[in-house]
Structure formats: C-alpha cells, structure tokens
C-alpha cells in the first residue's frame, strides 16, 4: 500500500569495487522520485541523493568512513511534485537494502602490472598499488594500506612459446621469480583475499609480456 501511483523500490543491490560503492535499484521512476538513507547498524540514518529520478546513489563517501562497519540503506519513494505526500500509514513508502560490509564484500578491481625487470635469471614483477577512496589523515589509502596482509596477489607466468601457467604468490606487491635465460615470458596477476568466502578474487590483469615497453632487461 502507499500513495496512488507510487511504487516501492525493489532489487536493491550494492555495486562496489575497491570501495567505490553505489546502491542500485528498480524501477525506473514514472511520476515519482527517490531519496536514499544509509546507516550503520547502531548509527543514525543519513539522507543522500535527495528526490532523485536516478535509480542509483553513490554512497562511497559514507561507507569509507569505516569500511569494517556493516551498513544498511533504504530507498524512499515519493510522488513527483508532491514529496510531502506519505503512504497510507503516514510514512513514505520505502524498501530496505541487504546489509553490506565493505571490507568483506567490495569487489577487488582488476589489478595492473606496473613494471617488470629482468636481471639474469630472475624477474621482479611489481603490481600497481591502486589508490582507493578510503581516507586516513586526509590522505587516500591504497588497497594494500586498507587490506594489509589480508590481500595477496597471484602471479601467472608462462613462456611465450608455451601454454602452461606457473604461479607465484606474494603478500606484498612484488614478485621475484626464476626464469630461463633467453626465454620471453608473459605475466598476469590476480588479487585474492583468501579469508573471504565470496568475492575472493579479482579479474585477471591485462597480460604483459617481455619485449614490450613495461619491461627492462639487465645482464
């Protein structure tokens, strides 16, 4: 029930990658607008995206205040041009989102291989430490700053002439691997949070191969 021609939002979904967090919902509004509220389990509701005709709301600024907290959002529906109007119970129509804990649930963004350097039969591969929108002391933290040793990277590496992918792992952002002299290798990395049961892995980074500009070779 609710005000005539006003429907409650549904399919409320969190879309979050590296803590950039957007709440999405349906339906596309017809003669209605939406306002979103967000709260921690024990906190007060804060309103965002006032009277919008969008079906998404960027809540990053709120969740980065404490990424280990669990958040709940709700989407209010109002008749367009009459936002004071309420439902039959005297309350605006609204729908709750699922709970969301950024630290446990944000997707890991696609990593990037920053560089690789060969010295003899060793190659040092460095993964870019991506900046997030999480702040501490007025500076933006990197993914490694936020997750610490909870975040590992898996390196897949293979001879350009073969298909079998060897693996290495690091809980920093650097790998040091053994290679055969005179062979060209290709590399791809994946971010992993092993302690998670969902959203454990990122997509693979773009493949980088020796003999391309990111690499450096020294005897």
């Amino acid at each position: 029930s609710g005000t005539t021609n006003t429907v409650a939002a549904y399919n409320l979904t969190w879309k979050s990658t590296n803590f950039k967090t957007i709440l999405e919902w349906e339906p596309k509004p017809v003669n209605q607008v939406y306002t979103v509220q967000i709260s921690t389990k024990s906190g007060d509701w804060k309103s965002k995206c006032f009277y919008t005709t969008d079906t998404e709301c960027d809540l990053t600024d709120e969740i980065v205040k404490d990424v280990k907290q669990t958040y709940l959002a709700r989407v209010f529906s109002y008749p367009a041009g009459n936002v004071e109007s309420t439902g039959s119970a005297g309350e605006p129509l609204y729908e709750n989102s699922p709970e969301f804990t950024p630290y446990l649930e944000t997707n890991l963004g696609q990593p990037t291989i920053q560089s690789f350097e060969q010295v003899g039969t060793k190659v040092n591969v460095t993964v870019e430490d991506e900046r997030t929108l999480v702040r501490r002391n007025n500076t933006f933290l990197s993914l490694r700053d936020v997750f610490g040793k909870d975040l590992i990277y898996t390196l897949y590496y293979w001879k350009s002439s073969s298909s079998g992918k060897k693996t290495a792992k690091t809980n920093t952002n650097e790998f040091l691997i053994d290679v055969d002299k005179g062979e060209n290798y290709c590399f791809s990395v994946q971010a992993v949070i092993p302690s998670r049961t969902v959203n454990r892995k990122s997509t693979d980074s773009p493949v980088e191969c020796m003999g391309q500009e990111k690499g450096e070779f020294r005897e």
């Epitope: 040793k149 590992i152 898996t154 897949y156 298909s163 079998g164 992918k165 060897k166 693996t167 290495a168 792992k169 690091t170 809980n171 691997i177 053994d178 791809s188 994946q190 992993v192 092993p194 302690s195 998670r196 049961t197 969902v198 454990r200 892995k201 693979d204």
Partner: antibody, heavy 120, light 107 residues
Framework: EVQLVESGGGLVQPGGSLRLSCAAS????????IHWVRQAPGKGLEWVGY????????YYADSVKGRFTISADTSKNTAYLQMNSLRAEDTAVYYC?????????????WGQGTLVTVSS | DIQMTQSPSSLSASVGDRVTITCRAS??????VAWYQQKPGKAPKLLIY???FLYSGVPSRFSGSRSGTDFTLTISSLQPEDFATYYC?????????FGQGTKVEIK
Amino acid sequence: EVQLVESGGGLVQPGGSLRLSCAASGFNIAYYTIHWVRQAPGKGLEWVGYIDPSNGYTYYADSVKGRFTISADTSKNTAYLQMNSLRAEDTAVYYCARDPQSFSSPFDYWGQGTLVTVSS
Amino acid sequence: DIQMTQSPSSLSASVGDRVTITCRASQDVNTAVAWYQQKPGKAPKLLIYSASFLYSGVPSRFSGSRSGTDFTLTISSLQPEDFATYYCQQHYTTPPTFGQGTKVEIK
C-alpha cells in the same frame, strides 16, 4: 561443509582414455584452484596438474603433459581430468584437492580418491 | 623443479615417544611448506601449513619448524592414531612437489 568427490575411475587398456570428475560442494570452485594428485599403489604422492577455474589457466607435470587435460565447469562446480594415451605407469589413485590460494596455500581439502587401473 | 628430500623413509616408535621427521628443499622455498598425514586407503590430511602453523582441528602435539631450507615435523608424544605415513610438500613454486613420505610404524 566443504566436500570434494571424485568419480570416473576404473579399468582401462593401455592407450585408452578415461575422464575423471571432481564434484565440489560447500564452496565455489571459481574462487579457488583445483589440483589433481595421484598415488601409485604403495608409492608416494605425485602432483599431476592444476586449473584455476576463474580463468582456465592450467599447468601439468612433465609426466602427463600432452596426454592429460584439466578442465572445469563452474556452473556444475566440477573439475575434470581427461586422460588420454594411458600407460601402465598411470595406474594410481587419483585425488582432487582444493588450493585456497592463500599466501601459504597448501591443499586444505582432498577428495576420497578414485582408482585408475591401466592394464591389458 | 624443487626437490623435497624427506627422511627417514620409515621409523618404528612406541606410544608416548617423541618423533621427528625432516625435509630438505633443494632451493629456497621461504616458509611455503606443508605437512600431511595419510592413513591406508584414505586421502591425505593437512596438519601443518606455512612451515609452522597448525591447521584447524589438528592436535597440538604436532608442530613444524624451519631452519633455512630444512623443515621438521615433530610429534611430541606419539598416540595410537598417529601411526600413518607423513608427507612434506613445497608450494612455493609450480610444480608443487612432495617428499617421498615417512611411514611411522609401531615398535
């Protein structure tokens, strides 16, 4: 509860083929790496190969390279070991095992194994 | 490939004995060594990971240590259920490799 169940073992003639399955439950194989390990009668453990189901990447032991193929179907939460050109020395119990891809990354769960006998 | 040389291949011991099994890696593997226990007709079970960390549910009489490329599994006081074969494994690099196994038998 995490479980891995192998099936498909049996008696096969030299030169023949067999396909083993490793059905996983209690976790999503797309988030892990699945390895195959074998054990010949009265012998030790020998690593066969792995697959990362999230990207299809594989690597094989030299002893099976070119003859064995590991694949995975994430919709069925199952990994497979296709064994071709089988030899008497491939006779073994075949286990699948889960690699959590942590920095320490041991095989934390194993299936019960399925016996493959290659004999004429 | 990295070789894991495990010794002894077998040993006889009594309940209550302290038992030590060693594994030597042919090159540096950091702490990426695990120990498994296997009983006849059963799959291996993880005991120790990262050289010295006790896996969940494993009794505290099992412990692991590292000194360079040498790794040790110790059972402080052997129990009847501990008679089995033990394997070390390095997972520092592909391919992961196992030691040859140590069979612990009743004296």
